[in-house]
Interface confidence: low
């Protein structure tokens, strides 16, 4: 008996042959006898079967000796034996029509969790085997998790259905709903302006939700929420904001903020956070500010940083084409007795300049001391 | 040894139709699908579609709906592709190329190179 | 559709050089892309599947990485037998779309 396997929703075509290929007589029935449809010279007939508004043929392909059965719409319930009687032969086709489904929604927050749900026909021993955008393999029986998604497995999962050694592949599409970056760091002098930008690694039709930005600022004992926002089919707009500091928000996407300018009580570490509506979970995006501080009190040159430095970070003072006069890997150096010229204060990685402010150094004329 | 075999080389005339072929051997012909790409003289690859020969079943880029038919025999674990109504855009080295589950386009036939012309 | 850049489209190296090839995708594909070899006159090449993972029977200089949207193919110690076409191709939907390829030359 040949098998062939069909997908919920979609059409099928189940072949019959005859060995004269002229247009004869034939019946497709199902496995209760039931005729589904047949010809009557030229016409097409149909009986009572339940698939009548979905069943057809190609009555130009009659003349050649091929009757094929058309079934539209495929639902779980037309898996059945399907019976084609031409010249006193009896051809019989296994139909098996499975679905597969998400659980409840194909938008799914970062870290939630994936179930692949597989409708079959009873009687039926399907395993299943899904690809992820990311080139990874899971294989179930009826239902496939993964949990803890991650952004790369956003995109279309194949997966594909085996029963009776034959193959049939399904495509969907899953969005995982995150910011592009979980982290980020921005490097500042003091007194600059300050853009934060979160931007999302999915698009839709309507984004609808709010936020807000917590912000732990180094000097601070606890953290204080910066900002509150509204978003409305892509449209933001702010709730509410602290008086310092005086944040502006962009009102499109992507999620833009920005702090007037850099101060060393702002530097630290903030979580901005996104509730989207319909959505269990929010949506979080880490963001840190470094601020540098070069000053010159008296007889002292000193440059400092503030906020979250990893440890191998290098803090340098140097007078301008000259080697460091003083490097180490401190929140703060210093010289005394600078010569003068143009100084230059560099916080560094590994070599690559992440944060430079200059002071120039001006000149001192002492007064000869008196005998 | 996984080997596809394709059709020789193929001189037509604007608006006629070519039919090539790809012979599979060295697997089972019916578990793995059987796509086809298009190279024209100096540029890149185009993927213009898939069968799969276990069901016939097709999967064709946009692009060459309407240019491209593609069938199979299982009997003779053979492979073809039609190309209709043939303009000069058609020439070019046209490739058959096996696919798995779980890997790209891993054995591809040696190409075989269409030429339009009057 | 999605587009595969690659830059850049002509590399020139010395024998025995490190070479990598840019793969830049229109939109986020997670690591579903796939590298090809061409030399002159010959069929593709499958080197690298899903961004990393080696091919049986490839020589090990040649390595991927990249996820997202950039994704890089390295060769690193390039031999004359490298001169070649390279290719991307996007697995992630369809169609399957392939990048317009580097060409690698000896200086």
């Known amino acids: 008996k040949k098998v062939v396997l069909g997908k919920k929703g979609d059409t099928v075509e189940l072949t019959c042959t005859a060995s004269q290929k002229k247009s004869i007589q034939f019946h497709w029935k199902n496995s209760n006898q039931i005729k589904i449809l047949g010809n009557q010279g030229s016409f097409l007939t149909k009986g009572p079967s339940k698939l009548n508004d979905r069943a057809d043929s190609r009555r130009s392909l009659w003349d050649q000796g091929n009757f094929p059965l058309i079934i539209k719409n495929l639902k779980i319930e037309d898996s059945d034996t399907y019976i084609c009687e031409v010249e006193d032969q009896k051809e019989e086709v296994q139909l098996l029509v499975f679905g597969l489904t998400a659980n409840s929604d194909t938008h799914l927050l970062q870290g939630q969790s994936l179930t692949l749900t597989l409708e079959s026909p009873p009687g039926s021993s399907p395993s299943v085997q899904c690809r992820s955008p990311r080139g990874k393999n899971i294989q179930g029986g009826k239902t496939l998790s993964v949990s803890q998604l991650e952004l790369q497995d956003s995109g279309t999962w194949t997966c594909t259905v085996l029963q009776n050694q034959k193959k049939v592949e399904f495509k969907i599409d899953i969005v995982v709903l995150a910011f592009q970056k979980a982290s980020s760091i921005v490097y500042k002098k003091e007194g600059e302006q300050v853009e934060f930008s979160f931007p999302l690694a999915f698009t839709v039709e309507k984004l609808t939700g709010s936020g807000e930005l917590w912000w732990q600022a180094e000097r601070a004992s606890s953290s204080k929420s910066w900002i509150t926002f509204d978003l409305k089919n892509k449209e933001v707009s702010v709730k509410r904001v602290t008086q310092d500091p005086k944040l502006q928000m962009g009102k499109k996407l992507p999620l833009h903020l920005t702090l007037p300018q850099a101060l060393p009580q702002y530097a630290g570490s903030g979580n901005l956070t996104l509730a989207l509506e319909a959505k269990t979970g929010k949506l979080h995006q880490e963001v840190n500010l470094v601020v540098m501080r070069a000053t010159q009190l008296q007889k002292n040159l000193t440059c400092e940083v503030w906020g979250p430095t990893s440890p191998k970070l290098m803090l340098s003072l140097k007078l301008e084409n000259k080697e460091a006069k003083v490097s180490k890997r401190e929140k703060a150096v210093w010289v005394l007795n600078p010569e003068a010229g143009m100084w230059q204060c560099l916080l560094s990685d590994s070599g690559q300049v992440l944060l430079e402010s200059n002071i120039k150094v001006l000149p001192t004329w002492s007064t000869p001391v008196q005998p | 040894e996984v080997q596809l075999q394709q059709s020789g080389p193929e001189l037509v005339k604007p608006g006629d139709s070519v039919k090539m072929s790809c012979k599979a051997s060295g697997y089972t012909f019916t578990d793995y699908f059987m796509d086809w790409v298009k190279q024209s003289h100096g540029k890149s690859l185009e993927w213009i579609g898939y069968?799969?020969?276990?069901?016939?079943?097709?999967n064709n880029n946009q692009k060459f709906k309407g240019k491209a038919t593609l069938t199979v025999d299982k009997s003779s674990s053979t492979a073809y592709m039609e190309l209709h109504s043939l303009t000069s855009e058609d020439s070019a080295v046209y490739y058959c190329a096996r696919r798995g589950y779980d890997e790209g386009f891993a054995y591809w036939g040696q190409g075989t190179l269409v030429t339009v012309s009057s | 559709d999605i587009l595969l850049t690659q830059s850049p489209a002509i590399l020139s190296v010395s024998p025995g050089e490190r070479v990598s090839f840019s793969c830049r995708a229109s939109q986020i594909i997670g690591t579903s892309i796939l590298w090809y070899q061409q030399r002159t006159n010959g069929s593709p090449r499958l080197l690298i599947k899903?961004?990393?993972e080696s091919i049986s029977g490839i020589p090990s200089r040649f390595s991927g990485s990249g996820s997202g949207t950039d994704f890089t193919l390295s060769i690193n110690s390039v031999e004359s037998e490298d001169i070649a076409d390279y290719y991307c191709q996007q697995s992630n939907t369809w169609p399957f779309t392939f990048g317009g390829g580097t060409k690698l030359e000896m200086k």
């Open positions: 069968i799969y020969p276990n069901n016939g079943g097709t």
């Open positions: 899903y961004a990393s």
